[in-house]
């Protein structure tokens, strides 16, 4: 499955989107860095074959659709760019699964992929429970403004590599 | 492979004006921070300030505040620190470092070569 | 501003020595402590961040621990390559702060 180019400019579009989110000076936040375990080796693209990144990269996108389409991140972000950048991950989701139906049927995809989509999913769970114990505050969501960003560069990064392999 | 060039020595008057770059290549500028760090001669570290390429928002040690402005253009990966009028007491040797922001990553991972200033009439 | 004091300014210590230097913030950073190592018309290096973890590159033999207010940074054994001043710094709050250095020169 070839990922239509639109859907890197996409990805771009949504990093650009989620920088311009930011509300508050992020200075004022430093002691509010969290470490939440980004897993990176389940982006590092080496070990997987393609169904298996593809559906990695799915998961990724679902989870980060999912926390922003949450009662409290609409209270956190100015609607019109939230709006903007959840429509940009739904496109990105329907290409990624048109790309998962077509994948599956040509690859079997082993159940080490469970895992990883396990360790995507507590890594959000990871987010989620330090978003409520900091009470939603404006703070802790720059400090997830910042991870999320950082951890859709690692999805940017890894379907550039699968391009590179078709 | 992550590096941040700054520009060369300078030797000024007191009272004159100096603009210092620090470019940083092999990774994306407005993902981290460019913080600033003067050493007198044989003296210690000092924390100057802080940008944030991505938006220009600055802050500033409370010692360096109103003593030197500190910007970036992102459009060509460059931070900046400048002073409007040197003094004799700014003669020092500046590094520019990055920082990884609100991310939970290493601090000042990577630093400039330094940009020695003198200030002497 | 979150004050930074190490001890000692300074210390002599021979080759295979063990050396130990620590850092007191003057209130609470939890582990948002960098330790870094500079030589001689060099820019500083990151050792070690967030009070213990081993920057990318930095040899075992270095170690930070501590969280809170009290901070101590090991060279198991020191090697020659190690004579150098070594800063801690906090990273919890703006202002950043530096400790003033502490020189490690051969006995």
């Known amino acids: 499955c070839d990922l239509p180019q639109t859907h890197s400019l996409g990805n771009r579009r949504a990093l650009i989107l989620l920088a311009q989110m930011g509300r508050i000076s992020h200075f004022s936040c430093l002691k509010d860095r969290h470490d939440f375990g980004f897993p990176e080796e389940e982006f590092d693209g080496h070990q997987f074959q393609k169904a298996q990144a593809i559906s990695v990269l799915h998961e990724m996108i679902q989870q980060t659709f999912n926390l922003f389409s949450t009662e409290d991140s609409s209270a956190a972000w100015e609607q019109s760019l939230l709006e903007k950048f959840s429509t940009e991950l739904y496109q990105q989701l329907n290409d990624l699964e048109a790309c998962v139906i077509q994948e599956v049927g040509v690859e079997e995809t082993p159940l080490m992929n469970e895992d990883s989509i396990l360790a995507v999913r507590k890594y959000f769970q990871r987010i989620t429970l330090y978003l409520t114990e900091k009470k939603y505050s404006p703070c802790a969501w720059e400090v997830v403004r910042a991870e999320i960003m950082r951890s859709l560069s690692f999805s940017t990064n890894l379907q550039k590599r699968l391009r590179r392999k078709d | 492979e992550v590096q941040l060039v700054q520009s060369g020595a300078e030797v000024k008057k007191p009272g004159e004006s100096l603009k210092i770059s620090c470019k940083g290549s092999?990774?994306?500028?407005?993902?981290?921070?460019i913080g600033w760090v003067r050493q007198m001669p044989g003296k210690g570290l000092e924390w100057m300030g802080i940008i944030d390429p991505s938006d220009s928002d600055t802050a500033y040690s409370p010692s360096f505040q109103g003593q030197v402005t500190i910007s970036a253009d992102k459009s060509i990966s460059t931070a900046y620190l400048q002073w409007s009028s040197l003094k004799a007491s700014d003669t020092a040797m500046y590094y520019c470092?990055?920082?990884?922001?609100?991310?939970?990553?290493?601090?000042?991972?990577?630093w400039g070569q330094g940009t020695l200033v003198t200030v002497s009439s | 501003d979150i004050q930074m004091t190490q001890s000692p300014s300074s210390l002599s210590a021979s080759v295979g020595d063990r050396v130990t230097i620590t850092c007191r913030a003057s209130?609470?950073?939890?582990?948002?402590l960098n330790w870094y190592q500079q030589k001689p018309g060099k820019a500083p290096k990151l050792l070690i961040y967030f009070a213990s973890s081993l920057q990318s590159g930095v040899p075992s033999r270095f170690s930070g621990s501590g969280s809170g207010t009290d901070f101590t940074l090991t060279i198991s054994s020191l090697q020659p390559e190690d004579f150098a001043t070594y800063y801690c710094q906090q990273s919890y709050d703006f202002p950043l702060t530096f400790g003033q250095g502490t020189k490690v020169e051969i006995k």
């Open positions: 209130q609470s950073i939890d582990g948002s």
């Open positions: 470092a990055r920082h990884p922001g609100l991310n939970w990553a290493p601090d000042f991972d990577y």
């Open positions: 092999g990774y994306s500028f407005t993902s981290y921070w």
